[in-house]
């Protein structure tokens, strides 16, 4: 099976790497524009220069291209707690990230929110906080893990998953209650 190619890919594959086929004349291969620039005018003929112009402020191209316009720079989502790691340049988009002791939770492939790393109070750090993953905690005896926080077994209801972890405590509480009914 031959992989399906879009019109642009088909046209580009006729020319050597770093060149693209002239949109009005398929016998001409024009040199692509360098990153940080965009296509202003196609080359007039074989061996002649493509007219490439530098991206304006607030826009970029990160690879060689024959785009008619530069791409708009991304803006960091302050409402999601994001901070700017590096600002946009003509050849590189804005890089957004999180503050120290925070991790990214991805809502979708390109939308993330910053959350504080768990401190594992009443427990120990099993796996340290990573760029895209919260700390993994192990709880001390008498505590169980709920939403990555160590919660006292006194808050464990029989219907919850914590019953196995907190079984001795629950039995003790039950035993204490029973002993008062003589």
């Amino acid at each position: 099976l031959v992989p399906h190619l879009g019109d642009r890919e088909k046209r580009d594959s006729v020319c050597p790497q770093g060149k693209y086929i002239h949109p009005q004349n398929n016998s001409i291969c024009c040199t692509k524009c360098h990153k940080g620039t965009y296509l202003y005018n196609d080359c007039p003929g074989p061996g002649q220069d493509t007219d490439c112009r530098e991206c304006e402020s607030g826009s970029f191209t990160a690879s060689e291209n024959h785009l008619r316009h530069c791409l708009s720079c991304s803006k960091c989502r302050k409402e999601m707690g994001q901070v700017e790691i590096s600002s946009c340049t003509v050849d590189r988009d804005t890089v957004c990230g999180c503050r120290k002791n925070q991790y990214r939770h991805y809502w979708s492939e390109n939308l993330f929110q910053c959350f504080n790393c768990s401190l594992c109070l009443n427990g120990t750090v099993h796996l340290s906080c990573q760029e895209k993953q919260n700390t993994v905690c192990t709880c001390h005896a008498g505590f169980f893990l709920r939403e990555n926080e160590c919660v006292s077994c006194s808050n464990c209801k029989k219907s919850l998953e914590c019953t196995k972890l907190c079984l001795p405590q629950i039995e003790n509480v039950k035993g204490t209650e029973d002993s008062g009914t003589t």
Partner: nanobody, 117 residues
């Protein structure tokens, strides 16, 4: 095919409450991030609130923090938005949405919330 059906919108007085519901089908709801998006008259789409598959992570727009609560019932494939202390500026069409690469691609038909005296 992702299908999202909102209900619960209506006319409410300032300070009043509404609870929006969203019935989801056509995908694995349990493990999916979900949210509510709104579009006020003449404005763009904005995320109001988001919740992850297990309900551990949530997001609230600054304008609704402390007033709105997002929740989900994975056994019913349903997403909720409890809206309290409603204000005139909350008037908008509210959409149930599944975040995607193009942020607002997967959303329902919307339910109109009007806050007016």
């Amino acid at each position: 095919e992702v299908q999202l059906l909102e209900s619960g919108g209506g006319l409410v007085q300032p300070g009043g409450s509404l609870r929006l519901s969203c019935a989801a089908s056509g995908f694995t709801f349990k493990g999916s991030n979900m949210g509510w998006v709104r579009q006020a008259p003449g404005k763009g789409l904005e995320w109001v609130s988001l919740i992850d598959g297990r309900g551990q992570h949530t997001y609230y727009a600054d304008s609704v923090k402390g007033r709105f609560t997002i929740s989900r019932d994975n056994s019913k494939n349903t997403l909720y938005l409890q809206m309290n202390s409603l204000r005139a500026e909350d008037t908008a069409v509210y959409y149930c949405a599944k975040p995607s690469v193009r942020e607002f691609d997967y959303r329902g038909q919307g339910t109109l919330v009007t806050v007016s005296s």
